[in-house]
Amino acid sequence: RDCAEVFKSGHTTNGVYTLTLPNSTEEVKAYCDMEAGGGGWTIIQRREDGSVDFQRTWKEYKVGFGNPSGEYWLGNEFVSQLTNQQRYVLKIHLKDWEGNEAYSLYEHFYLSSEELNYRIHLKGLTGTAGKISSISQPGNDFSTKDADNDKCICKCSQMLTGGWWFDACGPSNLNGMYYPQRQNTNKFNGIKWYYWKGSGYSLKGTTMMIRPADF
C-alpha cells in the first residue's frame, strides 16, 4: 500500500508510515504528506539541509537511503513497482533561497524496471516551475556514479554528482550537491531545475511526491 491507501484508511496526519507493495511482504518506510493538495502523497525524494550524501551507488539508489523524516531517496525499485501497478502523478515541489516556491506536476509518471535502468516516463506537464520540462523528454535511463547510462560521452553522475535521469547531461539534477545560502550561485554541480532558476542556481529544498491519478 502507498500513502494514498494509508490516507484512505483514516490516517490523515503527516509522518513516516510503513508501506508495502501489493502481493509482497517487503516493507519500506516513507514520509506521507497528508495535507498538501488533498493529501495521500508518497514522498519519494526530499532535500532540505544537506545532511545526507546523495552521491551514492546504483544499489543504494535502488533500495533507498537517508531518513524519511528528513533528506532521503525512497528507492527506485519500490517506485518502479508501485508506478507500474496503476497510473501515478508526480509532483515536484521546489524552494529557492529567496523564499520563492514553485512546482511541476506530471499527470502520468512511471519508472521502467531495473533491466531498463529505471528509465523515467512522464506526460502532461503543468505548474509554475517552467513551461518546459526540466527532466528531459523523452525520459532517460537512471545513472549513478557506478552506472553510466547517460547520453554524454562524459560521466554525468560523476561530473554533476548524484544519481539522476541524466541526458547529456540535461537541465535538472535534484540529487546534486547541496550548497548553503550565499554559496548557492554559479555552482555547476548543485541542485538544479533549469527552467525555473536557470543555470548554476542550487536550490534550497526539493520534494518529489507521487499519488495515484485517480485519488
Epitope: 554524454c152 560521452i153 562524459c154 560521466k155 560523476q158 561530473m159 554533476l160 541526458d167 547529456a168 547531461c169 540535461g170 537541465p171 554559479n186 555552482k187 555547476f188 554541480n189 538544479k192 533549469y194 527552467y195 536557470g198 543555470s199 548554476g200
Partner: antibody, heavy 121, light 107 residues
C-alpha cells in the same frame, strides 16, 4: 548546423564604446549560454564574461565589471557585448562562443569568427 | 579565481612524434577541464571536454587525461595539420580561466 556569426571590424577612439553582436542559428537559443573571450595581438585568451540565453543571467570577470554589459535578444537569437570607456589595450579580437548552459557545461563550442576591435586616437 | 598554468609554452616536434602538454590548476577541478586548438587567424576549436572526452569529429590521436589539479593533452603521431596553439580551460567555476597556451611547431 550550429553557427555563430559576429559583426564586423570596429575602429574606436579611446573613451568610446563598442557593441559587438553574435547572431546564432541551428539550435535552441534558450538552452545555451554565451561566453565572450578576447585575444590581444600575439596574446592568449581572456574571458570577459557570460550570459544565459535562457534568462539573461550574467557573470562578468572582475576586471571588466562596470565596463561591460552582455545582453541577448531571443527574438533574433542574438547575443551582444558592449564594452565602454575603451583604452588602447582593449585592442583585440573579440569572440563569442556558445556553451551548454542547460547542462551547466561551460566549455565553448562553437565559436564565432571573431570581431577585431581597434582602439586608437 | 582559479589559475591555470600550462607547460611547455612552446614545443617543436617532428611528424609522427608524440607531444604531451600539461595543465595545472590552482585548485581541484574534478574533471571540469577543456582543451582547445587555435590556428593563426582563426577562432579556437574545442578538442576535449570533461578532461578526457573527445569532441565529435576530433581525430583519435588527440587524448586527454587527468583529474583534480593535473591534466594532460597528448597528441599521438603528430600530423602537419596539428600545428597551432593549444589552450586548456577550467569550467569548474566562474570566472572561466584559460592556460597561457602552448605553441606547437612542426620541425
Amino acid at each position: 548546423q550550429v553557427q555563430l556569426v559576429q559583426s564586423g571590424v570596429e575602429v574606436k577612439k579611446p573613451g568610446a564604446s563598442v557593441k559587438v553582436s553574435c547572431k546564432t542559428s541551428g539550435y535552441t537559443f534558450s538552452n545555451n549560454g554565451f561566453s565572450w573571450v578576447r585575444q590581444a595581438p600575439g596574446q592568449g585568451l581572456e574571458w570577459l564574461g557570460w550570459i544565459s540565453g535562457y534568462n539573461g543571467n550574467t557573470n562578468y570577470a572582475q576586471k571588466f565589471q562596470g565596463r561591460v554589459t552582455m545582453t541577448t535578444d531571443t527574438s533574433t537569437s542574438t547575443a551582444y557585448m558592449e564594452l565602454r570607456t575603451l583604452r588602447s589595450d582593449d585592442t583585440a579580437v573579440y569572440y563569442c562562443a556558445r556553451d551548454q548552459d542547460y547542462s551547466n557545461f561551460h566549455w565553448l563550442d562553437p565559436w564565432g569568427q571573431g570581431t577585431l576591435v581597434t582602439v586608437a586616437s | 579565481d582559479i589559475q591555470m598554468t600550462q607547460s611547455p609554452s612552446s614545443v617543436s616536434a617532428s611528424v609522427g612524434d608524440r607531444v604531451i602538454i600539461t595543465c595545472r590548476a590552482s585548485q581541484g577541478l574534478s574533471s571540469w577541464l577543456a582543451w582547445y586548438q587555435q590556428k593563426p587567424g582563426t577562432a579556437p576549436k574545442l578538442l576535449i571536454h570533461s578532461a578526457s572526452s573527445l569532441q565529435t569529429g576530433v581525430p583519435s590521436r588527440f587524448s586527454g587525461s587527468g583529474s583534480g589539479t593535473e591534466f594532460a593533452l597528448t597528441i599521438n603521431s603528430l600530423q602537419p595539420e596539428d600545428f597551432g596553439t593549444y589552450y586548456c580551460q577550467q569550467a569548474n567555476s566562474f570566472p572561466l580561466t584559460f592556460g597561457g597556451g602552448t605553441r606547437v611547431e612542426i620541425k
